[in-house]
């Protein structure tokens, strides 16, 4: 019942091409105190989506605000979709340290599949 | 089972710097936080430090930063911390703690500690 | 950083009598505070984490309540083995604090 769980809801979720990705990801503990992240990908290749902590995400929303000390909804909203984003989407808590904060737990993971967006119904001749 | 060795006694002379160490046994050392705590005599328990074996990271208390030192040395299942510029402020017990809770804040398991006395 | 205030500092009791030590934090930290008992010349060892949580073979009259910043450890029917020094600790960090603890005597 103490130990930290990464819980991420969906296997997978599907979106249009064009449109907003919601990724869910929550935590049941406050503790350990740290930063979480976001990658697409797992092993050393993964791609930095999210941070918590630092740096600019212009394409990437958070679902609720995440500076409120008790806050355990991390879950991000990724706009404008492109089949470049298909892959599988990892929600990791770290515990903070110096220099560099320490991986501590990753959610199961949310494979993200992308659909060709719907054409617009042409207007009749 | 989990153990924490730690040398019984280290004494100094003020200004000089001292290395104490302690050996880990028992378990997968690179995956537990190891935290440094310090008593005065007849004082109370004042946590110093961590540090996390797998990759070296630290947190200190503001008032260790430029005190101690942590590292370890993974090839011996060893973590040290060095004190520098020595006073008698510094004689005290240091002690090494680890295990499962040290991730959560908690110490489940607590070397002997090492008494250092800071004497001319 | 999160100061930790312990009381009372010192408490007499004797076998088989009910203690209480309180434990109140500077500011919330939710669930996550540890106990520890500490015997003279010893190492501390865990007695409770998480508040109320306790630890691998510690006795069953030992429990831990309290959450926000007002917490506390009670002994019922206290043994002899039982007295020595007690300490709060923060968990919601790093850095940890701990408390400057109480010291559970014979009367």
């Known amino acids: 019942e103490d130990e930290l769980q990464v819980i991420q809801p969906e296997k997978s979720v599907s979106v249009a091409a064009g449109e907003s990705a919601t990724l869910r990801c929550a935590m049941t503990s406050l503790i350990p105190v740290g930063p979480i992240m976001w990658f697409r990908g797992a092993g050393a290749g993964r791609e930095l989506i999210y941070n918590q902590k630092e740096g600019h995400f212009p394409r990437v929303t958070t679902v609720s605000e995440l500076t409120k000390r008790n806050n355990l909804d991390f879950s991000i909203s990724i706009s404008n979709i492109t089949p470049a984003d298909a892959g599988t989407y990892y929600c990791v808590k770290f515990r903070k340290g110096s220099p560099d904060d320490v991986e501590f737990k990753s959610g199961a993971g949310t494979e993200l599949s992308v659909r060709e967006a719907a054409l617009a119904p042409t207007a009749p001749l | 089972q989990v153990q924490l060795q730690q040398p019984g006694a280290e004494r100094v002379k003020p200004g000089a710097s001292v290395k104490m160490s302690c050996k880990a046994s028992?378990?997968?050392?690179?995956?537990?936080?190891i935290t440094w705590v310090k008593q005065r005599p007849g004082q109370g328990l004042e946590w110093i430090g961590d540090?996390?074996?797998?990759?070296?990271?630290?947190n200190h208390i503001e008032k260790f930063k430029s005190k101690a030192t942590l590292t370890v040395d993974t090839s011996s299942n060893t973590a040290y911390m060095q004190l520098s510029r020595l006073t008698s402020e510094d004689s005290a017990v240091y002690y090494c703690?680890?295990?499962?809770?040290?991730?959560?804040?908690?110490?489940?398991?607590w070397g002997q500690g090492t008494t250092l006395t800071v004497s001319s | 950083d999160i100061q930790m205030t312990q009381s009372p500092a010192s408490l007499s009791a004797s076998v088989g009598e009910t203690v209480t030590i309180t434990c109140r934090a500077s500011?919330?930290?939710?669930?996550?505070l540890a106990w520890y008992q500490q015997k003279q010349g010893k190492s501390p060892q865990l007695l409770v984490y998480?508040?109320?949580t306790l630890a691998e073979g510690v006795p069953s009259r030992f429990s831990g309540s309290g959450s926000g910043t007002q917490f506390s450890l009670k002994i019922n029917s206290l043994q002899p083995e039982d007295f020595g020094n007690y300490y709060c600790?923060?968990?919601?960090?790093?850095?940890?604090?701990f408390g400057s603890g109480t010291r559970l005597v014979i009367k």
């Open positions: 600790q923060h968990q919601y960090g790093p850095p940890f604090t």
């Open positions: 703690a680890t295990g499962y809770g040290s991730s959560y804040g908690y110490f489940d398991y």
């Open positions: 028992g378990y997968t050392f690179t995956s537990y936080w």
């Open positions: 500011e919330n930290i939710y669930s996550y």
């Open positions: 540090i996390y074996p797998g990759s070296g990271s630290t």
């Open positions: 998480t508040a109320k």
